[in-house]
């Protein structure tokens, strides 16, 4: 059931996000999410998992884009790309906006 | 969009209890801790407690521990509060809030007789 | 008696700069992070600043936050009439095992 907490050793992660006490969080793997809102510069965010590791196999979108670890701090330095938009087709001396 | 409804409040004598609902929508629940904090009228913010994501740990303010119960049910999106032997000093706005960002519209308790 | 000490008052004129400052200990803004929350009247709080210094999406950059030690300000610049309200830091305490909050700033744009 992937909505059951994971019970394995936990390991200590950089939390950098709204949800945050501290610098680091413990967890059963360490995430980076670079989110994308509806009109906005995206936000990368740097925390713990310990729910929905099926979130972890996602491909990147241009929305968002979840990438995790399972080693000490090894979500500190991870960068994360979105997917680039696929422009629709464009029609000869039509202007792009 | 996240969104969190509170309901619940309402006129109690001392002594009463209510049970405070949070209906939490537009992200994915279970994946959040969720806190209450309160707002006595014409003062600051007070927080009350909070569950983590499974509900297996939660954490209270001293004065609220043995009184009040949080709880949620991640198959309903929902976070509640019990509130045991209330007191005329916990008259206030309780709000329900996904740590650490968003806060819904808060629901008014009153204890008085 | 809150557990982050702020000033009650703050007041500044149109296109001012103005700093809240939060004053705490070593088990709360000393060893954690600091957010800022900015309350409108009658409306709830809204999250301004997270991590010490960042602001959310939709925040705009005339708000900054800083820490130093167990002390944070909240920075306010080009101060507007619409920035009047109440201001709250807050962290998580790990000696009572909770989150505590500033007693509140009330900001008038004067």
């Known amino acids: 059931d992937p909505v059951k907490p994971s019970r394995g050793p936990l390991v200590t992660c950089t939390c950098e996000s709204p949800h945050c006490k501290g610098p680091t969080c413990r967890g059963a793997w360490c995430t980076v999410v670079l989110v994308r809102e509806e009109g906005r510069h995206p936000q990368e965010h740097r925390g713990c998992g310990n729910l929905h590791r099926e979130l972890c196999r996602g491909r990147p979108t241009e929305f968002v884009n979840h990438y995790c670890c399972d080693s000490h701090l090894c979500n500190h330095n991870v960068s994360l790309v979105l997917e680039a938009t696929q422009p629709p087709s464009e029609q000869p001396g039509t202007d792009g906006q | 969009e996240v969104q969190l409804l509170e309901s619940g409040g309402g006129l109690v004598q001392p002594g009463g209890s209510l049970r405070l609902s949070c209906a939490a929508s537009?992200?994915?629940?279970?994946?959040?801790?969720m806190s209450w904090v309160r707002q006595a009228p014409g003062k600051g913010l007070e927080w009350v407690a909070n569950i983590n994501q499974d509900g297996s740990e939660k954490n209270y303010v001293d004065s609220m521990r043995g009184r009040f119960t949080i709880s949620r049910d991640n198959s309903k999106n929902t976070l509640y509060l019990q509130m045991n032997s209330l007191r005329a000093e916990d008259t206030a706005v309780y709000y329900c809030a996904r740590e650490f960002d968003y806060w819904g519209q808060g629901t008014l308790v009153t204890v008085s007789s | 008696q809150s557990v982050l000490a702020q000033p009650p008052s703050a007041s500044g004129t149109p296109g001012q700069r103005v700093t809240i400052s939060c004053s705490g200990s070593s088990s709360n803004i000393g060893s954690n992070y600091v957010y800022w929350y900015q309350q409108l009247p009658g409306t709830a709080p809204k999250l301004l600043i997270y991590g010490n210094n960042k602001r959310p999406s939709g925040v705009p950059d005339r708000f900054s936050g800083s820490k130093s030690g167990t002390s944070a300000s909240l920075a306010i610049s080009g101060l507007r009439s619409e920035d009047e309200a109440d201001y709250y830091c807050a962290a998580w305490d790990d000696s009572l095992n909770g989150r505590v909050f500033g007693g509140g700033t009330k900001l008038t744009v004067l």
């Open positions: 537009g992200f994915t629940f279970s994946s959040y801790a």
